[in-house]
Amino acid sequence: KSPIFGPEEVNSVEGNSVSITCYYPPTSVNRHTRKYWCRQGARGGCITLISSEGYVSSKYAGRANLTNFPENGTFVVNIAQLSQDDSGRYKCGLGINSRGLSFDVSLEVSQGPGLLNDTKVYTVDLGRTVTINCPFKTENAQKRKSLYKQIGLYPVLVIDSSGYVNPNYTGRIRLDIQGTGQLLFSVVINQLRLSDAGQYLCQAGDDSNSNKKNADLQVLKPEPELVYEDLRGSVTFHCALGPEVANVAKFLCRQSSGENCDVVVNTLGKRAPAFEGRILLNPQDKDGSFSVVITGLRKEDAGRYLCGAHSDGQLQEGSPIQAWQLFVNEESTIPRSPTVVKGVAGGSVAVLCPYNRKESKSIKYWCLWEGAQNGRCPLLVDSEGWVKAQYEGRLSLLEEPGNGTFTVILNQLTSRDAGFYWCLTNGDTLWRTTVEIKIIEGEPNLKVPGNVTAVLGETLKVPCHFPCKFSSYEKYWCKWNNTGCQALPSQDEGPSKAFVNCDENSRLVSLTLNLVTRADEGWYWCGVKQGHFYGETAAVYVAVEERKAAGSRDVSLAKADAAPDEKVLDSGFREIENKAIQDPRLFAEEKAVADTRDQADGSRASVDSGSSEEQGGSSR
C-alpha cells in the first residue's frame, strides 16, 4: 500500500476554493522530490495539473498553487474558482505520476444552493446581522406579528409583537413594524450564532386568514483564508467586520487546544508576551476594519487565527469573526539575521537589515517599536536623508553592504535605546525584520574626546584610540550628515597609550582639520569596518568659534557628551512630512540568546544551530 495519505473525498460547491493536504513520510528523499497533483483519465493515465517544479496546467492558470512543507511531511494543493468541470478523480503524489507513491482523491463540485419554493433564503456570516422581511395584507395590519423557528416537527415562537422574546435570542433580536404605508414587518437578529440556522416562519394574524412567509437562514462559519508566509518574514491580517461593530473592541486570537482562542492582541491593550516587539494593531477605520501585522515569523506562529469584535476583547459566541490558517514555510527566502544586538552605554551598535535584493532601489527605513496602546513604530531614519531630530549625529542608515542588506549604525547609546527596532522598505512588505537592542554592562571600545571646540582658520587634530582587538580592521574618520557619513583623511599616529594591557597593536588615529571654517562644525565619527561591514563607532561634536589666541589645537581625551517631527509607521503608512510612503506595512524577529562575542563588527553575528541569534555591539 502507498505511504501517501490524504482526503479520499472532497465535496464543494461551484465558485468555492479547496485546499487539499497530502501527507508523506518526511524522509530526506521524499522532502526534496517532485510533488504533483494529476487528474486520472478514463484510460488510466494521470495528466499533471500542477507540480512542485513550477508546472501549472492551462486549466489551473491563475487559480491553483502547490506548496510543499517538508518539515511537516505535507504538501498542499489549493484550487480556487471551482466549477462542476473540476469534478473527477485525482491523485496527489511524489516522484513520477505513473509510479506507486500516490493517493487517490475524489473531488465532487456541485451546483450552488437554489431557492426553495416560496422560501426566502438568507445567507449570513457568523456573528453578523440578518433582517428577515415579512409581508402581510391589510386585514392583518392590526393583528399579532410573530416569528417561529422550526425545531424538528414543531414551530417554536422566537419573538412576537406583544413583547415576547425567546430566551435564546435575548438581547439580540427585535421586531420592527414599518410605517402605516408599508405592509411589512421585519425581524432583526444580531450576533448570529451557528445554532440560529434553520427554517423560520413569520406570521401576521393567528387565524386561518393569517399571512405566512417561510425563511431559510443559513449561518456561515467563516472559511479560513489560507496564508503562506516565510519563516522570519511578516504577515498582515486585514480584518473587515462591518460598520455595525465599528465601536466594539476588536481582537486577534490564535486557536490553541480545545475551544480556547488565546488573544494575540486586542484594542483594550492586551498583547501576548510571545509577540512583544513584533506586532502592531493598526488603528481601525470608520467602517470598523483594522489590520494586524506580525513580523519575525516563527515556526510556532503557524496555526488558525481569528479576528473579531466583542466588548470583552476576546472570542465569544456571536462575535463576528474572520479566520485565517497561517502556514509558515521553513524553506524561507529571508536570510537569518541577528535578532538581538548588544551594546554598552556610550558605545554603539551596527545592525544588518535584510531586504529583497530585487528591490535595491526601494527606500529603506528603521523605526522604534513602541508597545503603548496597540503598538506603533515611529520612524527614526530613512535612506532618503531624513533623520529624526533627536537622533542627529548618532544614527545613520547606510546602503552598504548592498545586495540584499543595509546597515544601521546607532552610537552614543544610553539605557533608553534598549528596545525593539524594525527594518523595512517601501517595497516587499514581507521583508520586515525586528532586532532587539540590549544595553549591557561595559565600556565603549573606542575612545574619543568629549566636546571639541575648533578655532576659525586654525588646525584641529582629534584623536581616536582603537584597542588592539581592532588591529585587523580598517579604521576611519567621517563627517556625519543626514545621508550618511562622508569619509575623511586620517593619520595613524602609532600605538595608543589609552589602554591598559594592550600591546603595540592598539592604535591612535587622528582626524586633522586644516584651516577650520564654519562648515566644519558638526558631528564626526571614528569607527572600524571590514570591507563593507561596519563595526563600532564613536562620535565627537566639533564646535567652531572665533579666534582667541594663535596656534593649532590638539585635543586630548575627555568624557564624551551625548548630543542632544515624528514619522510613525503603520500598515498603511500615513503621509508624514510631505512624504507619502506606499504601504510598507510592518515586521519582526524571534528574540534569542546565544553567546555574546567581543565583536567589533557589531553587524556580523555568528549564527548558532538554534533559532536564536545575537550580535555584539561593544565588548565588555
Epitope: 479547496v18 457568523l126 475551544e259
Partner: nanobody, 126 residues
Amino acid sequence: QVQLVESGGGLVQAGDSLRLSCAASGRTFTTYGMGWFRQAPGKEREFVTTITWSGSTNYKYYADSVKGRFTISRDNAKNTVYLQMNSLKPDDTAVYYCAASTVLRDPRVPTEYDYWGQGTQVTVSS
C-alpha cells in the same frame, strides 16, 4: 467546552450494517473537524475516519482498513456526524469513539483532537 455523545452501537452479525451518530454541543463554532477512532481490547486507539470542513467544503479521510465499507457524513444544522458502517467484519469489533478538533494538522493522530466522547461498543459476531 464541546460535549460529544455517541449512539448507535450494538451487536450485529458479520456482513450487517450499523449507523453511529455523534452529536456535538457547546462551543461547536470553534470546531474544524470530527472523526471516529476505535479501540479493541488490548490494542491502541486506531484512526477510522474523519471529516473536516471549511465553509461549504468537506474533506473525508478514511483508514485503509475501512475504505469502501464505511462512510462518514455530517449534518451541519444538527451538529452531528454519522458513521455508516456496511459489510461489517468481526475485526471491526471495538469501542468506537467520536473526536473533535479545533486545529487539525494530521487527522490520523489522536493527540490532534481536543474533545472525545465516552465511546459506544460495536460487536460483530461471526
